[in-house]
Interface confidence: low
C-alpha cells in the first residue's frame, strides 16, 4: 500500500468471543457462501473520495470507542491510531477499555515513504453498519507514524482485509476478517462498492456525501446492473488476480501477457490509482495519447504530477479512450474484460487555484511492483471478494461516473488461450516486505 | 518554449503609481504568473502571483509588504499579467521580473522564486523620495 498515490498502508487472536452477538435474521434463506439480496442496514456505509481513502464507522473496545477506519483490501492488518497526532481528531485510548488485552509485542511497518509503528493487543470490535456482531480482534495500537495519517481524511486507522501471509510483524497475526468469519456466522466473502464523485468534494462535502457500500457476509443486488464475472483469485496473500490482455479503444496493446502481471497484479481499495509496471504503463500512455492527440498535455501531466483544466463542464470527456483490462475467466480457456471511462481514471482534484475551472490528474502511473487496480478502477465496478470460493467478482457498479455515451463494462466470455502463462511466478525470497 | 517580456517601468516619486506588464507566450494549459523583484545587493523575493487558468484570472497571491497597495491582474487576452503599483514607496525600488510556472495540484508556497523555472528579463523601478 504506497504513500502519496498507495495511501499509507501496509490481526484477532481465536480468544473467546466475547459479547457475541449474532448475526440480524432476515427473510431470505442464506445461501453459500454468502447471504444475496439486500443489507438495507450496510448500504452506503462508507465515506471518503479516492485520493485519501474510503472509510468505515467501528467501535473499539468497552466501553465502545468510535473510528473511522479505512478499508484497505492491499494489507492485513487492523491499525488505529492510539496516540494524539496532529491530524487525528481522536484515537483508540486503551487505558479506557476494561476488554483491552495486550500482546506484549512490537509491530514496524514501513513504507517506501514514512512508516507507522505499534503495540499489539486484541480487543473487541464491531462496526455499527456492519453485522450485528462483536468480535475480538488483533489491534496494533499505532503510537507512532511518519507520512501515514492523512490530514483532513477523517479516518484513523486501517482495516487491512487481505491475507495473513502479508499480515505485519508476521503471519501468525489473526487479520480480523479471518476473526469475523471464525467467531461468527458471517459468511467468508465481503463486497465493495467505491463511488468516486466525480467532481472535487471539499472537507464538509466528503463528510456529508455517501463514499459507497462495504458488504460484509454478502452481495447485494441494487449495487450492480447486468451480471457479476468471477477471475479467480491466484495466491491467498494480497489480492492477486491475473490479467490477460489490455486494450486501448479497442486496440490490443499487443505485449507478452507476462509484463501485465509482472511481478503480480492486485485488487487494492487503499491505492488511488491504477498502477501499471514500467514497460505496460509506457506504452498505455504512448496508446492513451495517441487517442487523445487533438489535444496537447504538458509531460508533467501524463506523469501524474500535473493537472489540466477545462472551463466548468466542457471537459472533453469524448477524446479519451476507454481501457479494457481482460481478467482470468473461472473456466478454461475463457476471458472476460472489464471497460473503464476517462471519467475513472482522470481523477477530479480541487485546484488550488480557482473554482471556475473542472480540474484533473492523470490517475494512471508506473509501478515497480506489479499492476495495482486502485480506487480508480474499483470505482467503475462493483467488486465481490468471495474468498469463500476464492475468487473475486465484477460488474458494473450503480453508482459510477459515466455520460450519456459510454458506460463502464463487464463483458464476456471472450475466448483466450494459455492464460496460466500469464502469471508471474516470483522467485521464492523474502516476499514480505512493504517497501513498495 | 515559454516566452516572457516585461514592461512598464520607469521611475517615479514616492506615493505615486505604475503599472507593469507581462506578456506571455508559449503555454498551452493552466500556469501561474509571479511577479519578483530584486533590489541592489538584496535577494529576490516575491510580490505576486496569479493563477492563469482556462476560464480566466484564478487566486491571487500577494507578499504582506504590498498587500493593499499592489493589484495583480489577467489581461482580456489571457496572455497578459498586469501588476498595478500604487502607494510606491523608496522600498519598492528594484528590478522586477515576470516569472510563469506549470500550475500544478502541489503548488504552495507560491511566491519562492525556486518554484518558477521560466523568467523574463526584468524591468527597472525606481521610486524617489
Known amino acids: 500500500t504506497q504513500h502519496g498515490i498507495r495511501l499509507p498502508l501496509r490481526s484477532g487472536l481465536g480468544g473467546a468471543p466475547l459479547g457475541l452477538r449474532l448475526p440480524r435474521e432476515t427473510d431470505e434463506e442464506p445461501e453459500e457462501p454468502g447471504r444475496r439480496g439486500s443489507f438495507v442496514e450496510m448500504v452506503d456505509n462508507l465515506r471518503g473520495k479516492s485520493g485519501q481513502g474510503y472509510y468505515v464507522e467501528m467501535t473499539v473496545g468497552s466501553p465502545p470507542q468510535t473510528l473511522n477506519i479505512l478499508v484497505d483490501t492491499g494489507s492485513s492488518n487492523f491499525a488505529v491510531g492510539a496516540a494524539p497526532h496532529p491530524f487525528l481528531h481522536r484515537y483508540y485510548q486503551r487505558q479506557l477499555s476494561s476488554t483491552y488485552r495486550d500482546l506484549r509485542k512490537g509491530v514496524y511497518v514501513p513504507y517506501t515513504q514514512g512508516k507507522w509503528e505499534g503495540e499489539l493487543g486484541t480487543d473487541l470490535v464491531s462496526i455499527p453498519h456492519g453485522p450485528n456482531v462483536t468480535v475480538r480482534a488483533n489491534i496494533a495500537a499505532i503510537t507512532e507514524s511518519d507520512k501515514f495519517f492523512i490530514n483532513g481524511s477523517n479516518w484513523e486507522g486501517i482495516l487491512g482485509l487481505a491475507y495473513a501471509e502479508i499480515a505485519r510483524p508476521d503471519d501468525s497475526l489473526e487479520p480480523f476478517f479471518d476473526s469475523l468469519v471464525k467467531q461468527t456466522h458471517v459468511p467468508n466473502l465481503f463486497s465493495l462498492q467505491l463511488c468516486g464523485a466525480g467532481f472535487p468534494l471539499n472537507q464538509s462535502e466528503v463528510l456529508a456525501s455517501v463514499g459507497g457500500s462495504m458488504i460484509i457476509g454478502g452481495i447485494d443486488h441494487s449495487l450492480y446492473t447486468g451480471s457479476l464475472w468471477y477471475t479467480p483469485i491466484r495466491r491467498e496473500w494480497y489480492y492477486e488476480v491475473i490479467i490477460v490482455r489490455v486494450e486501448i479503444n479497442g486496440q490490443d496493446l499487443k505485449m507478452d501477457c507476462k509484463e501485465y502481471n509482472y511481478d503480480k497484479s492486485i485488487v487494492d481499495s487503499g491505492t488511488t490509482n491504477l498502477r501499471l509496471p514500467k514497460k505496460v504503463f509506457e506504452a498505455a500512455v504512448k496508446s492513451i495519447k495517441a487517442a487523445s492527440s487533438t489535444e496537447k498535455f504538458p509531460d508533467g501531466f501524463w506523469l501524474g504530477e500535473q493537472l489540466v483544466c477545462w472551463q466548468a463542464g466542457t471537459t472533453p470527456w469524448n477524446i479519451f479512450p476507454v481501457i479494457s483490462l481482460y481478467l482470468m475467466g473461472e473456466v478454461t480457456n475463457q476471458s472476460f474484460r472489464i471497460t473503464i471511462l476517462p471519467q475513472q481514471y482522470l481523477r477530479p482534484v480541487e485546484d488550488v487555484a480557482t473554482s471556475q475551472d473542472d480540474c484533473y490528474k492523470f490517475a494512471i502511473s508506473q509501478s515497480s511492483t506489479g499492476t495495482v487496480m486502485g480506487a480508480v478502477i474499483m470505482e467503475g465496478f462493483y467488486v465481490v471478494f468471495d474468498r469463500a470460493r476464492k475468487r473475486i467478482g465484477f460488474a458494473v457498479s450503480a453508482c459510477h461516473v459515466h455520460d450519456e455515451f459510454r458506460t463502464a463494462a463487464v463483458e464476456g466470455p471472450f475466448v483466450t488461450l494459455d492464460m496460466e502463462d500469464c502469471g508471474y511466478n516470483i522467485p521464492q525470497t523474502d516476499e514480505s516486505t512493504l517497501m513498495t | 518554449d515559454v516566452q516572457l517580456q516585461e514592461s512598464g517601468g520607469g521611475s517615479v516619486q514616492a506615493g505615486g503609481s505604475l503599472r507593469l506588464s507581462c506578456a506571455a507566450s508559449?503555454?498551452?494549459?493552466?500556469?501561474?504568473i509571479g511577479w519578483f523583484r530584486q533590489a541592489p545587493g538584496k535577494e529576490r523575493e516575491g510580490v505576486a502571483a496569479?493563477?492563469?487558468?482556462?476560464?480566466?484570472?484564478?487566486?491571487?497571491y500577494y507578499a504582506d509588504s504590498v498587500k493593499g497597495r499592489f493589484t495583480i491582474s489577467q489581461g482580456n487576452d489571457k496572455n497578459t499579467v498586469y501588476l498595478q503599483m500604487n502607494s510606491l514607496k523608496p522600498e519598492d525600488t528594484a528590478i522586477y521580473y515576470c516569472a510563469a510556472r506549470s500550475l500544478s495540484w502541489y503548488s504552495h508556497p507560491l511566491l519562492q522564486p525556486s518554484q518558477f523555472n521560466n523568467w523574463g528579463q526584468g524591468t527597472q523601478v525606481t521610486v524617489s523620495s
Open positions: 496569479i493563477a492563469i487558468v482556462n476560464s480566466g484570472g484564478g487566486r491571487t
Open positions: 508559449g503555454y498551452s494549459y493552466s500556469y501561474y
